[in-house]
């Protein structure tokens, strides 16, 4: 790594993956192991994120980019850059302080994460219940009884929500 020649700031020519070493006459030195600099002109390198415990490594740290974490099986990522891992529950459950608990009657959760939500109230839209709700599925609303005349079109139930993955959001 050669010494930079910038008149303004001798550190400005230090590329990503290096730092401007004040202890060595502002020479561009490579980032030490387990550290990185993602932009040029940095005076220090950042310590790499450690994906430990409930976090696991999705992408290894390099000299120019931080490590990326996701969560171990049985947990899912939350937050920007997977800053948190939350325990999975089964469909039909929600996570409480005391662990996974079944959804109360009248509520459902079709994912392994999140909270139980109330069944749709079909009558608010002037419709009737075509398929009863369960802990895992919302009710399916059908046409109102008045619409059930010969020739009326059938109702297609909504597709189930996609299961969340374990990758960062």
């Amino acid at each position: 790594f050669e010494r930079t020649r910038s008149l303004q700031d001798p550190c400005s020519n230090c590329p990503a993956g290096t730092f401007c070493d004040n202890n060595r006459n502002q020479i561009c030195s490579p980032c030490p192991p387990n550290s990185f600099s993602s932009a040029g002109g940095q005076r220090t390198c950042d310590i790499c994120r450690q994906c430990k415990g409930v976090f696991r490594t999705r992408k290894e740290c390099s000299s120019t980019s931080n490590a990326e974490c996701d969560c171990t099986p049985g947990f899912h990522c939350l937050g920007a850059g997977c800053s948190m891992c939350e325990q999975d529950c089964k469909q039909g459950q929600e996570l409480t302080k005391k662990g996974c608990k079944d959804c109360c009657f009248g509520t459902f959760n079709d994912q392994k994460r999140g909270i139980c939500r109330p069944w749709t109230n079909c009558s608010l839209d002037g419709k009737s219940v075509l398929v009863n709700g369960t802990k895992e599925r919302d009710v399916v609303c059908g046409p109102s009884p008045a619409d059930l005349s010969p020739g009326a079109s059938s109702v297609t139930p909504p597709a189930p929500a996609r299961e969340p993955g374990h990758s960062p959001q």
Epitope: D46, I47, R49, Q50, K52, G53, V54, L78, G79, A80, G81, S83, M84, E86, Q169
Partner: antibody
Framework: QVQLVQSGAEEKTPGASVKISCKAS????????IHWVRQAPGERPEWMGW????????RNSQKFQGRVTITWDTSASTAYMELSSLTSEDTGVYFC?????????WGQGTLVTVSS | DIVMTQSPSSLSASVGDRVTITCRAS??????LAWYQQKLGKAPNLLIY???NLQSGVPSRFSGSGSGTDFTLTISSLQPEDFATYYC?????????FGQGTKVEIK
């Protein structure tokens, strides 16, 4: 430079609700989290919950479950925190803070006073 | 919940002194630890994240170390503007929790 600007001080009576806003400006294009932290007089900060600006995902501390609602208005780049069923123990300063990892940018705080 | 305990709760020091504040977690948090400085009537200000990374714009006299359950914030040479309250905070497990604070006062 990221800036978080919170709404003004509030005085409430026990049993009431309070809704505080936190407007983000500057680099608000990235996917980041807005956390809410409260601090009672002379006490340590207490984490309340967060919302993700990208997908609206939100979680609250179990201590406040059922009493706190955190929302995000994308068009206004503003987070809101509503706390219901207030008691005198809810008196304190409420902060919003942005995080792409640590809580790196904070709002100025909103003083909430609950008294009869 | 993970309990964060700081020591000492307060200390008196002079300008130029080396100051060390410790923080202990009730269970292992790897390097998911941050340090904040808070002055009266102001929001906390991030100093150190991921145990030892200095936040941009923070003077190099602040440093952090540790791993697992025991962590340290060091101010190598105390300056007049450093008199404040310091908090550690873990972000390994929700709810994120803070230490009770260490107040650094002028001797």
């Amino acid at each position: 430079q990221v800036q978080l600007v919170q709404s003004g001080a509030e005085e409430k009576t026990p049993g009431a609700s309070v809704k505080i806003s936190c407007k983000a400006s500057g680099n608000t294009f990235n996917n980041y989290d807005i956390h809410w932290v409260r601090q009672a007089p002379g006490e340590r900060p207490e984490w309340m919950g967060w919302i993700n600006s990208g997908n609206g995902d939100t979680r609250n501390s179990q201590k406040f479950q059922g009493r706190v609602t955190i929302t995000w208005d994308t068009s206004a780049s503003t987070a809101y925190m509503e706390l219901s069923s207030l008691t005198s123990e809810d008196t304190g300063v409420y902060f919003c803070a942005r995080a792409e990892g640590p809580l790196d940018y904070w709002g100025q705080g909103t003083l909430v006073t609950v008294s009869s | 919940d993970i309990v964060m305990t700081q020591s000492p709760s307060s200390l008196s020091a002079s300008v130029g002194d080396r100051v060390t504040i410790t923080c202990r977690a009730s269970q292992g948090i790897y390097n998911y630890l941050a340090w904040y400085q808070q002055k009266l009537g102001k929001a906390p200000n991030l100093l150190i994240y991921a145990t030892s990374n200095l936040q941009s714009g923070v003077p190099s006299r602040f440093s952090g170390s540790g791993s697992g359950t025991d962590f340290t914030l060091t101010i190598s040479s105390l300056q007049p503007e450093d008199f404040a309250t310091y908090y550690c905070q873990q972000s390994y497990s929700t709810p994120w929790t803070f230490g009770q604070g260490t107040k650094v006062e002028i001797k």
